[in-house]
Amino acid sequence: ILLRAVTGFSGDGRAIWSKNPNFTPVNESQLFLYDTFPKNFFWGIGTGALQVEGSWKKDGKGPSIWDHFIHTHLKNVSSTNGSSDSYIFLEKDLSALDFIGVSFYQFSISWPRLFPDGIVTVANAKGLQYYSTLLDALVLRNIEPIVTLYHWDLPLALQEKYGGWKNDTIIDIFNDYATYCFQMFGDRVKYWITIHNPYLVAWHGYGTGMHAPGEKGNLAAVYTVGHNLIKAHSKVWHNYNTHFRPHQKGWLSITLGSHWIEPNRSENTMDIFKCQQSMVSVLGWFANPIHGDGDYPEGMRKKLFSVLPIFSEAEKHEMRGTADFFAFSFGPNNFKPLNTMAKMGQNVSLNLREALNWIKLEYNNPRILIAENGWFTDSRVKTEDTTAIYMMKNFLSQVLQAIRLDEIRVFGYTAWSLLDGFEWQDAYTIRRGLFYVDFNSKQKERKPKSSAHYYKQIIRENGFSL
């Protein structure tokens, strides 16, 4: 095993930074391992509804906090109406999926497209029809849907009426929405994600103000939002586990995102401690209650005593173990801009392999789905995205090394993203798609980039052949 726990750090992620060369079975400078992934490895690709659907007020869809935020906070962006128009060009998305040959497609449901004001009453028929058609088409193609219930597009009405995720009333409302989705789509969906990267929802939505709803500076609100997101996830997991799993036989998790960090001085225990704090304050914040002991990490409880809410003993018991696998996001959103508080004066790193090893050590070697991975290119780059290929090759090599050399139980990989689209605070200034879309065109053709061809080959060969 590459990264072995050393004395004093047993079962603790700090061991990652205390490398003993005697325990390293592979030269760290060896960038690529020419080998295949396990048989039946789950290859997929993903999108977020707000990023690609467009049609932000078409066919009865209600506004989301991001639609509002775009109009009030983001300069030079009229709306997501341009985008890739997946709502209109569903068939083109399906063709793109066919081209790559993925085993699964991860997409999110736009809550306000189903329920314009967020409250579960009669669903918006056109919205229901869109997702139902998409699911039927995926099943027909033997492409497994992985469905995210919340990828940041909260119905604006819930923000205005309740204050959004700051108000614990939203927990039950989210559970009602999830129940509806399980009822309507659960026969065709075996993998559910409750919330995509709650860290960014809380930190950038309520701390830096860089994400919707754009509130900033209130640390108590940041941690209250995080608390409510965790409780909402847990409630939905228990709901699914009790009422839907017995007959739908699916799995449910939450996608947690993180950066990776390296100590300034690898032999310095204080720098190592700071790296541990850094990971704990971002990934551990959500992973510890869900994948760990049901509570916030002890360091966070000490350091943030005045702003971090508490879980009662009953709640700790309720939070613990509310994920059927570890869904992990590792991409630019957790790196740029990185919370300087989380950086702790250390050096950020794109070492996905080590991040996976940290998860293994901290959370008892869970089954892991890479639920989002990839990088970005400048918006001027069209189909020749060589940087994206380099990054993909690097990341995939790290995942393969983690599986083959470190015995980490990664069972699937989600390339991000299927299409160029709206990239949150970066709007349309960067591109993350494996398919190029000219946002100014009428037909929004999906043109495969070099990275799409490359990923197609990786999937076909199930890894790297010599």
Epitope: F273, K302, I310
Partner: antibody, heavy 123, light 110 residues
Framework: QIQLLESGPGLVKPSETLSLTCTVS??????????WSWIRQPPGKGLEWIGF???????NYNPSLKSRVTISIDTSKNQFSLKLNSVTAADTAVYYC???????????????WGQGTTVTVSS | QSVLTQPPSVSAAPGQKVTISCSGS????????VAWYQQLPGTAPKLLIY???KRPSGIPDRFSGSKSGTSATLGITGLQTGDEADYYC???????????FGGGTKLTVL
């Protein structure tokens, strides 16, 4: 060695505003591990927390005093201050400024105290 | 009325052992960390125990702290006359969003 020193009038008239300043020496009020606090002790009674302020300006106050209290910080002077409005005889006490500490590895509580200053509310 | 409950007084002879209890609830002691303070007559309080059971440098190991559930205990062994003081427990209360103290316990060394 960090030291805290309270300063301000020892006598305040009822209904007026009590104002105290704490000067920090041997350390900085800009550290992220500390909450700069005010605590008081009425004659013959126990300790009562008034509130604290973080270097960024964030504050927490005792709910029973919240409507009358303002704590501010001046990082350039390495000082923090207390204002308590509409005082009555019940506000007569020894007022301590203090450093409340909590880090990633340890919860310290109030680890450094000033010597205290007696404030009497009387006409 | 203090949020944390301490006995008003305890006493013991020199050389003996004494314990002072501090009782709270899940919103304070139960889910947070406890500190203990010693206030000698006419002086400012001094930190005696932090993080439930740790001693700052300079505090003799005759002083110890522990926590169980929603209660904390300060122990003093080998009592000395110089230990005569008021002792306070303190912690954060998550429901009140406030620092809370016990009412104080007067230790008399007989």
């Amino acid at each position: 060695q960090i030291q805290l020193l309270e300063s301000g009038p020892g006598l305040v008239k009822p209904s007026e505003t009590l104002s105290l300043t704490c000067t920090v020496s041997g350390g900085s009020v800009s550290s992220g591990d500390y909450y700069w606090s005010w605590i008081r002790q009425p004659p013959g009674k126990g300790l009562e927390w008034i509130g604290f302020i973080y270097y960024s300006g964030g504050t927490n106050y005792n709910p029973s005093l919240k409507s009358r209290v303002t704590i501010s910080i001046d990082t350039s002077k390495n000082q923090f201050s207390l204002k308590l409005n509409s005082v009555t005889a019940a506000d007569t006490a020894v007022y301590y400024c203090a450093r409340y500490s909590s880090t990633w590895d340890y919860y310290y509580g109030v680890d450094v105290w000033g010597q205290g200053t007696t404030v009497t509310v009387s006409s | 009325q203090s949020v944390l409950t301490q006995p008003p007084s305890v006493s013991a002879a020199p050389g003996q052992k004494v314990t002072i209890s501090c009782s709270g609830s899940s919103s304070n002691i139960g889910n947070n960390y406890v500190a203990w303070y010693q206030q000698l007559p006419g002086t400012a309080p001094k930190l005696l125990i932090y993080d439930n059971d740790k001693r700052p440098s300079g505090i003799p190991d005759r002083f110890s702290g522990s926590k169980s559930g929603t209660s904390a205990t300060l122990g003093i062994t080998g009592l000395q006359t110089g230990d005569e003081a008021d002792y306070y427990c303190g912690t954060w209360d998550s429901s009140l969003s406030a620092v809370v103290f016990g009412g104080g316990t007067k230790l008399t060394v007989l």
